[in-house]
């Protein structure tokens, strides 16, 4: 058993049929010694008396808010949550496996630049009685500070018969050094509580590996005289790190016909313009990637050819 | 070349070669990011590699003030990785195919380090740890980890040379 926060405790249980459970001793936070009784949740049934209460925690029915009283007055509360371990593996019932980039990916994180700011998100099908708390640091043995905001519901989607809820959080490294080569990864820890179930999820990454630039901006076409060719030009996204002579991007320009089956013409360039042939009903798209480190490509910025 | 006493290197040549290094480092092992290295007794085996840190003057402001600190750090790293790529970790079993990009990567590391430091002048170099794995799978694990950290190192070096070529070239 360990304290999650003031008056909230997590009981770690090996979860299998007829498991013996865990013996827990609760102590009433009061100077009083006599006439103390204990109840669980809204029930008025007295579970025991005295300054301490010993319980055997085996299942969710044994978890909840234990309250000690004296003469009708509440003295203190202890909320017990359960953390299940099945076959030596902690349960992951609350969050959905996003399976990208690999199985058992519950948290996904992205950064738009090297400033030390990043966003993480996760998915669940649970709509109520759900709370999240996020902590982060750079490194684990001698952690350096990362400040995370509160997790918020950022999207709702319908997937078949189910509703899926996306939560996200923004974090900022306290003393970021955008030009340095990271040697210690960022660690993100998410505590999830659904009713009386506790679970924790972690992710470890370097900012360089989660970089995904915003799409190029101000994508424009300039027809070239007496030619089917056009000059496509664009700019670095506003959110990308500066100076651009240092934090350089590379670009992929694609000409795509109306039909998905049509052959795509692709050009790669380090410049912010390119000359391509504009076909009728086609569109021109441009995306960006860090020039020197193969992290994710941005989403496409597109304009129609006509 | 970075001549002793602090005159400028051939920024444009260094830019071109460092960008080539980036390409080679990724072609040597593009899958490296998707390998599940954790289950292989993933004790930190590449902690001793030289990293370009915050105080090394490799940021745009530090380069403007005095690029020599940063260039020395980059040179140190290039020599370190060049030695690693020439060691038993990469020459031992399982052997790399003759057309593996590791050979080109090794030669390019040497080429860039020589551009930075002419014959006859010696910046101090970092000692290379004696990592001689007893098991072939450990050698593979080390290769992946070394290539992974090399990718990060050469990315910073390439940014330095690109910025230098754009803003510091005479």
């Amino acid at each position: 058993i360990w304290e999650l926060k003031k008056d909230v405790y997590v009981v770690e249980l090996d979860w299998y049929p007829d498991a013996p459970g865990e013996m827990v001793v609760l102590t009433c936070d009061t100077p009083e010694e006599d006439g103390i009784t204990w109840t669980l949740d809204q029930s008025s049934e007295v579970l025991g008396s005295g300054k301490t209460l010993t319980i055997q925690v085996k299942e969710f029915g044994d978890a909840g808010q234990y309250t000690c009283h004296k003469g009708g007055e509440v003295l203190s509360h202890s909320l017990l949550l359960l953390h299940k371990k099945e076959d030596g593996i902690w349960s992951t019932d609350i969050l959905k496996d996003q399976k990208e980039p690999k199985n058992k990916t519950f948290l996904r994180c992205e950064a738009k630049n090297y400033s030390g700011r990043f966003t993480c998100w996760w998915l669940t099908t649970i709509s109520t009685d759900l709370t999240f708390s996020v902590k982060s640091s750079r490194g684990s043995s001698d952690p350096q500070g990362v400040t995370c905001g509160a997790a918020t519901l950022s999207a709702e989607r319908v997937r078949g018969d189910n509703k899926e809820y996306e939560y996200s959080v923004e974090c900022q490294e306290d003393s970021a050094c955008p030009a340095a080569e990271e040697s210690l990864p960022i660690e993100v820890m998410v505590d999830a509580v659904h009713k009386l179930k506790y679970e924790n999820y972690t992710s470890s990454f370097f900012i360089r590996d989660i970089i995904k630039p915003d799409p190029p901006k101000n994508l424009q076409l300039k027809p070239l005289k007496n030619s089917r060719q056009v000059e496509v030009s664009w700019e670095y996204p506003d959110t990308w790190s500066t100076p651009h002579s240092y934090f350089s991007l590379t670009f992929c320009v694609q000409v795509q016909g109306k039909s998905k089956r049509e052959k795509k013409d692709r050009v790669f360039t380090d410049k912010t313009s390119a000359t391509v042939i504009c076909r009728k009903n086609a569109s021109i798209s441009v995306r960006a990637q860090d020039r020197y480190y193969s992290s994710s490509w941005s989403e496409w910025a597109s304009v129609p050819c006509s | 070349r970075a001549v002793p006493g602090g005159s400028s290197p051939a920024w444009t040549q260094c830019q071109q070669l460092s960008q080539k290094l980036c390409t080679l480092a990724w072609s040597a092992h593009p899958l490296v990011g998707h390998m599940d290295l954790r289950e292989e007794g993933d004790e930190e085996t590449t902690n001793d590699v030289p990293h370009i840190q915050c105080g090394d003057g490799c940021d745009p402001q530090g380069l403007r003030d005095n690029s020599q600190f940063c260039l020395q750090r980059i040179h140190q790293g290039l020599i370190f990785y060049e030695k690693l790529l020439g060691s038993d970790i990469f020459t031992g079993e399982p052997s790399l195919l003759p057309d593996s990009p590791v050979g080109q990567l090794h030669a390019s590391l040497l080429g860039l380090s020589q551009l930075l430091q002419p014959e006859g002048h010696h910046w101090e170099t970092q000692q290379i740890p004696s990592l001689s794995p007893s098991q072939p799978w450990q050698r593979l694990l080390l290769r992946f980890k070394i290539l992974r950290s090399l990718q990060a190192f050469v990315a910073v070096a390439a940014r330095v040379f690109a910025h230098g070529a754009a803003t510091l070239s005479p």
Epitope: - | S27, A28, H29, P30, L31, M35, D36, L37, E39, E40, D88, T91, G92, E93, P94, S95, L96, L97, S100, S134, Q135, P136, W137, L140, L141, R143, F144
Partner: antibody, heavy 126, light 111 residues
Framework: QVQLVQSGAEVKKPGSSVKVSCKAS????????ITWVRQAPGQGLEWMGE????????YYNEKFKGRVTITADKSTSTAYMELSSLRSEDTAMYYC???????????????????WGQGTLVTVSS | DIVMTQSPDSLAVSLGERATINCKAS???????????LHWYQQKPGQPPKLIYN??KLESGVPDRFSGSGSGTDFTLTISSLQAEDVAVYYC?????????FGGGTKVEIK
């Protein structure tokens, strides 16, 4: 075509040594390793060790506690396996095999004992 | 050392029937979660062994009635339809860790 030709059968006294040769042809000797495997009469296979001429690395089965020495002569494309302090339980068929052990981007681990010698019967008897 | 345990020791199967050979390692012999360092060899009487399955790949020239599966510590070689020429002893070999080790062998016969 690839061939591994081993030296002839040997009868040895306990405590003595035996040196078995394995002459390779039909491929670039230095590009592959040579593995030695033995098989006692009616028994299974036992890996003794292997040598890679290109890297100069040799791997041994510690079970033989320094009794086995594996070498290769690149100039004659011949590999050798010497076993000393022979005892009766060393009576076995000794095989050499070509070892291809490579790493690529797509398949990080490829190991094949793809061509074998005909075997050399070593009998240890007093 | 990694101990390789093969089962059964011997197996009698009718022609055209399926034969399944198991190999269990005392330690994981997959690398990076997926790549297998487990190989299968076939040995016919009076001959040296012959490689039939390399990691997760059937060697060229080996009939596709042979298939290998498994990861971690448990591996299986299956002959989907046994032919007379498949009568042999089959060995698994791990080369994740030196010393490389063979299983004890499984003798496949016709019932």
């Amino acid at each position: 075509q690839v061939q591994l030709v081993q030296s002839g059968a040997e009868v040895k006294k306990p405590g003595s040594s035996v040196k078995v040769s394995c002459k390779a042809s039909g491929y670039t000797f230095a590009s592959y390793g040579i593995t030695w495997v033995r098989q006692a009469p009616g028994q299974g296979l036992e890996w003794m060790g292997e040598n890679y001429p290109r890297s100069g690395n040799t791997y041994y089965n510690e079970k033989f506690k320094g009794r086995v020495t594996i070498t290769a002569d690149k100039s004659t494309s011949t590999a050798y396996m010497e076993l000393s302090s022979l005892r009766s339980e060393d009576t076995a068929m000794y095989y050499c095999a070509r070892a291809e052990f490579i790493s690529t981007v797509v398949a990080p681990y490829y190991y094949a004992l793809d061509y074998w010698g005909q075997g050399t019967l070593v009998t240890v008897s007093s | 050392d990694i101990v390789m345990t093969q089962s059964p020791d011997s197996l009698a199967v009718s022609l055209g029937e399926r034969a399944t050979i198991n190999c269990k390692a005392s330690k994981k012999v997959t690398i990076f979660g997926s790549t297998s360092a487990l190989h299968w060899y076939q040995q016919k009487p009076g001959q040296p062994p012959k490689l039939i399955y390399n990691g997760a790949k059937l060697e060229s020239g080996v009939p596709d009635r042979f298939s290998g599966s498994g990861s971690g510590t448990d591996f299986t070689l299956t002959i989907s339809s046994l032919q007379a020429e498949d009568v042999a002893v089959y060995y698994c070999l791990q080369n994740k860790e030196v010393p490389y080790t063979f299983g004890g062998g499984t003798k496949v016969e016709i019932k």
